[in-house]
Every structure is written in C-alpha cells, then in structure tokens.
C-alpha cells in the first residue's frame, strides 16, 4: 500500500519535524502551511484549519516562505543621488544603488544606504585607484617625466612627449612643448583613462604646476569622519 | 574603533620645538597620503604639511617652510610633524588626517569619508 500524505495542518511524530514549506505552530501544536513569497500569514491555523494566507498590500513583501502576519515594508524611495535598479514588488524589496559619477560610501545588505561623489584628482596628480561601486578614487602624485593636466575621476598620470628640441619642460601638470612640430616619440593627445563600473566626470581645468615623485606603496590607516576641512591649497 | 590620534602638542616659548605625533589604530585601510592641518582660533582650517608614503613627494605651508618636518615610521603605523623655531602664529589645534582633499591631490576638501584626528592643542607664547 501506498503511504499515507499528511495535509494540513497535522500532527508531527514525536521528535520529529515539519516538511518543507511547513512550520511548527506551537499554539495549535500542528505542522501548518507556510505562505509563499508575496503572501503573509492572514489566519494562523488551528488544530483543525490551515493556515490562511493573503497578498501583500501595495509597498510591502515577503521575499521568503513564511508565516508572518505582516508583510515587510519597501524602502524608501531611492534618493536623488541613487538609481532604483529593483523596483518593490509584493516579493521583493527595493534596491536602490548610486548613479553613475557616484559610490556606495555606507552600504546596506542590499543596495546603498549613502552615496558620495567620486573624487577628481587635481592637475599634477593622476588617478592610482580608479572608484569603484564601493570605493573611492585615490590619487597620487604624477612621476618625474609624466603629467596630468586635468581634473578627473579617471585619468591617469601620461608621459611627457619626447622632444628633439625642449621649447617649455614639461612637469607633473603640463605636458613638454617641443620647438618642433614633429617630436620623435608623441603621446596621444587626449588624457589617458582607467576604466570604471561608473562614469567619468572629467573637466578640463588650467595647468598647475605641482611636485612630481615616484609612485610608492601606501600608509596602513584607518577610516574615520573628517571635521569640515577648508585647508589652504598647494605648493 | 577607528582611529587617529596625536599626541605631542603643548605650550612652548617662541623659538622652541615641538615633535606632534600621530598613531593609527582600529579597523585599517592603506592610505597614500598623510598630513597635518592647523586651525587657529577664528580662523579656517589650514593645510601644514601631507606626505605621500613611500615617494619624495612633500607639501609644506609657505609660512612653515625650513621649520616643520613631517616624516613617518611605518613599522610604527605612525606619522610625525617636528616643529622647529616655532612662533605665536603657530598656536591652534593640529589635526592628523589620512588621504584627505586639496593638498593631497583632490579637487576638493569636502569629503567626509576620509580619517581624522580629534586634534592635539599648540600654544606657542612670546
């Protein structure tokens, strides 16, 4: 003979427990029905009835199984830095992540909490770590023999062109200027860009001179708040 | 916790020296450029000296040039500032911070993600 199925709600054998997509409900002391994902638990059941389940009403959802007897509410809309990239549904939360230029600066477990703008790096300094999702872009000093002129989250210290004849020496912020039109070796003439998940924001700016070193390994240091820093400018 | 703390500051007469410290502690992250900024009373906060780590590349405040040195000691997680000749006009509260706005190479100092320190007072008298 076949074995029997148990319906629900039913008594589980001692010790033992409830399947899948069933709970124990400890009042009734049955095995009872769990709702589907976009559903809650409307009427608990009893010894004798199921579980009774109902949609989640507009703004709320169950993403999971469950026996809840309200559904969970949506975040709150997406903020005007952020892109809604799922939109709430009866089974789903919304998730919201920064618009392109921008990064997660606190993330949440699902989606953004606080984005921030991707920093530029100033002229005399090229990007060493380009912004990711979640991090920030980090500059560094351009080396001798390399330049960046612009103001930009993802261009990177480029050489200097190579001259027959040095009309203007170049620096960490200028590109040489050879006598010739024709130097021997000339870089392309746009500024060299590190790939990025978000978009550029790059703006050409005035040259300004600044030193010039070899890149070199970093400083281990923790991250913290700043106070408002209004500090003087460079060299 | 996360933090940033200096140490080192004090009362000093005009002319005399004082060496700031500034030790990382907590959840670390590798940071390129270290540096102090000064704030007086009634006046903005302004940049003194930034470093970044292993290159020659210093900045220095035109009004403390030939008298401040920074420095640091990376076994130590530490970074200095020695303050030689030190005049009235040095006097404010010396704040460390990591990786942080113009000086350092960005195009802006708003940025508040970036690690500080709560400060350590100079007081230099004439």
């Known amino acids: 003979l076949p074995a029997q199925v148990a319906f629900t709600p039913y008594a589980p054998e001692p010790g033992g427990t409830c399947r899948l997509r069933e709970y124990y409900d400890q009042t009734a002391q049955m095995c009872c029905s769990k709702c589907p994902p976009g559903q809650h638990a409307k009427v608990f059941c009893t010894k004798t009835s199921d579980t009774v389940c109902d949609s989640c009403e507009d703004s709320t959802y169950t993403q999971l199984w469950n026996w809840v007897p309200e559904c969970l509410s949506c975040g709150s809309r997406c903020s005007s830095d952020q892109v809604e990239t799922q939109a709430c549904t009866r089974e789903q939360n919304r998730i919201c992540t920064c618009r392109p230029g921008w990064y997660c600066a606190l993330t949440k477990q699902e989606g953004c909490r606080l984005c921030a703008p991707l920093r530029k790096c100033r002229p005399g300094f090229g990007v060493a770590r380009p912004g990711t999702e979640t991090s920030d872009v980090v500059c560094k000093p351009c080396a001798p023999g390399t330049f960046s002129n612009t103001t930009s989250s993802t261009d990177i210290c480029r050489p200097h062109q190579i001259c027959n004849v040095v009309a203007v020496p170049g620096n960490a912020s200028m590109d040489a200027v050879c006598t010739s039109t024709s130097p021997t070796r000339s870089m392309a003439p746009g500024p060299v860009h590190l790939p990025q998940p978000v978009s550029t924001r790059s703006q050409h700016t005035q040259p300004t001179p600044a030193p010039s070193t070899a890149p070199g390994t970093s400083f281990l240091l923790p991250v913290g708040p700043s106070p408002p820093a209004e500090g003087s400018t460079g060299d | 916790q996360v933090q940033l703390v200096e140490s080192g500051g004090g009362s000093v007469q005009a002319g005399g020296s004082l060496r700031l410290s500034c030790a990382a502690s907590?959840?670390?992250?590798?940071?390129?450029?270290m540096g102090w900024f000064r704030q007086a009373p009634g006046k903005e906060r302004e940049g003194v000296a930034a470093?970044?780590?292993?290159?020659?590349?210093?900045y220095y405040a035109d009004s403390v040039k030939g008298r401040f040195t920074i420095s640091q000691d990376k076994a130590k997680n530490t970074l200095y500032l020695v303050m030689n000749n030190l005049k009235p006009d040095d006097t404010g509260v010396y704040y460390c911070?990591?990786?942080?706005?113009?000086?350092?190479?960005?195009?802006?100092?708003?940025?508040?993600?970036?690690?500080w320190g709560q400060g350590t007072q100079v007081t230099v008298s004439s």
């Open positions: 470093m970044y780590t292993g290159t020659d590349w210093k």
């Open positions: 907590g959840h670390t992250y590798r940071s390129n450029c």
């Open positions: 911070a990591a990786d942080f706005g113009f000086i350092c190479g960005y195009d802006s100092d708003d940025d508040p993600y970036d690690a």
